[in-house]
């Protein structure tokens, strides 16, 4: 890093510097290097860009090893191809008011960076760019089939049936993902769905995954120990392959399933995770599908008729999905 040793330059000729970065001789007068820019670390060998009025500020005379490229007092700024004098203010766009100060540009947002939390009046808030407006504004996504306007119907809205549990705020979008619905089948391969706006356009979309609460062929009741009424998570002795429309999972899985009760209770998944499963079909085609994997089950008396989709969604949602 210092100039005491002999000159050693990279084998290739002069380096190619990014646009606007000067090609200069290093501080030892040995090799041509790309000049360090404002705020970057500099050394004796890695000099700052002299064409921009920058110098290597080592902070204290004792420290002469590594400094920071700093602009001389009153140095101008180059921003978006325009030169601004020190102390000059300018609007870089309708969204930002900027000021040049000693070679450094600082900008303040002109648009509100406010956050909007969900409420009965606006369950799925997101920021959008409206035509003719500079700043993005909050809009509230209404579910497609909501015909009556007003929070008094909050309990019956689609997104509330699925139960939005917003947890994350991304740039201009309150990311919300609902809990997974109950599996559409009590045994065998079924479908579980959820609603999310966790996508590039912040639009509500429906996601689905395969699910199997328990195999249909398993006779689980005979495994219930004497004196017990339930077997919550029966042990599956051997790894299994999943089947889907004539296609078979490429890998074998030692999956957990939910058990049964003899006292009228039903056992459903409580904690789940979602993983991709590859299926190979007889024609050689391989397809990848997301599938629910059970971590824990719970036994309870909320056992609505399986054909009542809304009731089953309400009572038997998947909680605590890890994916």
């Amino acid at each position: 890093q210092n100039c005491s040793g002999p000159c050693r330059c990279p084998a290739e000729q002069a380096p190619r510097c990014p646009a606007g970065v000067s090609l200069v001789l290093d501080g030892c007068g040995c090799c041509r290097v790309c000049a360090k820019q404002l705020g970057e670390l500099c050394t004796e060998r890695d000099p700052c860009d002299p064409h921009k009025g920058l110098f290597c500020d080592f902070g204290s005379p004792a420290n002469r090893k590594i400094g920071v490229c700093t602009a001389k007092d009153g140095a101008p700024c180059i921003f978006g191809g325009t030169v601004y004098r020190s102390g000059e203010s300018f609007q870089s766009s309708c969204k930002y008011q900027c000021t040049c100060l000693d070679g450094a540009v600082g900008c303040m947002p002109l648009c509100s960076m406010d956050v909007r939390l969900p409420s009965p009046d606006c369950p799925f808030p997101r920021r959008v760019k409206l035509p003719g407006k500079c700043c993005e504004e909050w809009v509230c996504d209404e579910p497609k089939d909501q015909t009556v306007v007003g929070p008094a119907l909050a309990a019956y809205r689609l997104e509330d049936t699925f139960g939005p549990d917003p947890t994350m705020i991304r740039a201009n979008c309150l990311v919300q993902t609902t809990e997974w619905s109950a599996c559409s089948k009590t045994c065998g391969m079924g479908i579980s769905t959820r609603v999310t706006n966790d996508n590039a356009s912040c639009r509500l979309e429906k996601q689905s995954r395969l699910c199997m609460v328990r195999p249909c062929e398993a006779d689980l009741e005979e495994n219930i120990k004497k004196g017990k009424k339930c077997i919550r998570t029966p042990k599956i002795s051997k790894p299994i392959k999943f089947e889907l429309s004539g296609c078979t999972s490429v890998k074998t899985y030692r999956a957990k399933f939910c058990g049964v009760c003899t006292d009228g209770r039903c056992c459903t998944p409580h904690r789940t995770t979602t993983l991709p499963v590859e299926f190979k079909c007889p024609d050689g085609e391989v397809m990848k599908k997301n599938m629910m994997f059970i971590k824990t089950c719970a036994c309870h008396y909320n056992c609505p008729g399986d054909n009542d989709i809304f009731e089953s969604l309400y009572y038997r949602k998947m909680y605590g999905d890890m994916a």
Partner: antibody
């Protein structure tokens, strides 16, 4: 910066009507609703009502017959009216922004006394 | 009996984790209740902490978190600090109206 400020009389007589105004800045009343909440001396909070972003209202059933909330979006003002005031209505009255009650006014203390 | 109940007081030492519960006597707390938590510091106005069950309001440190389970919503505060000493209120939405809990006084010991 988001701010809400309540204004109105500090003293009203029993049977009179209380009118409070909540003036907001930093957000639009067409984007956010505004709630009214009160806190009697030494007690907890009581939700009174709300005017939603689209102008609809919901009220606490206990005050339904006495309460009216309206707004003038262009003036960024919400007006709260409570009729037939009683000494038990003595409290600090607050307006708060919808969406997690994230921003509140500083409150205005109203005493009902003859 | 109140529809929404909170413990009157909770306490904890600096650095500890405390939770404040908000119980609905009507049934399970769901996302349709849009559980909210607000803080009232001594002698000052109110400040929203959590909205929509688990979303922090602007400027609220991530030491504060909201959740729900069964018939309760909860506010958890980790790494307790002296300035957290305040009254905390929850509010639950019931289709046409909000109901506030009675409030919980948090005391930071020591």
């Amino acid at each position: 910066e988001v701010t809400l400020k309540e204004s109105g009389p500090v003293l009203v007589k029993p049977t009179e009507t209380l009118t409070l105004t909540c003036t907001v800045s930093g957000f639009s009343l067409s984007t956010f609703g505004v709630h009214w909440i009160r806190q009697p001396p030494g007690k907890g909070l009581e939700w009174l009502g709300v005017i939603w972003r689209r102008g609809g209202t919901d009220y606490n059933a206990a005050f339904m017959s006495r309460l009216t909330i309206s707004k003038d979006t262009s003036k960024s003002q919400v007006v709260f009216t409570m009729t037939n005031m009683d000494p038990v209505d003595t409290a600090t009255y607050y307006c708060a922004r919808d969406g997690g009650f994230d921003y509140w006014g500083q409150g205005t203390t109203v005493t009902v006394s003859s | 009996e109140s529809v929404v109940t909170q413990p009157p007081s909770v306490s904890g030492a600096p650095g500890q984790r405390v939770t404040i519960s908000c119980r609905s006597s009507i049934g399970a707390v769901t996302t349709s209740n849009y559980a909210n938590w607000v803080q009232q510091l001594p002698g000052t106005a109110f400040k929203g902490l959590i909205g929509g069950t688990s979303n922090r309001a602007p400027g609220v440190p991530d030491r504060f978190s909201g959740s729900k389970s069964g018939t309760s919503a909860s506010l958890a505060i980790t790494g307790l600090q002296a300035e957290d000493e305040a009254d905390y209120y929850c509010a639950l939405w019931y289709s046409t109206h909000y109901v506030f809990g009675g409030g919980t006084k948090l005391t930071v010991l020591g």
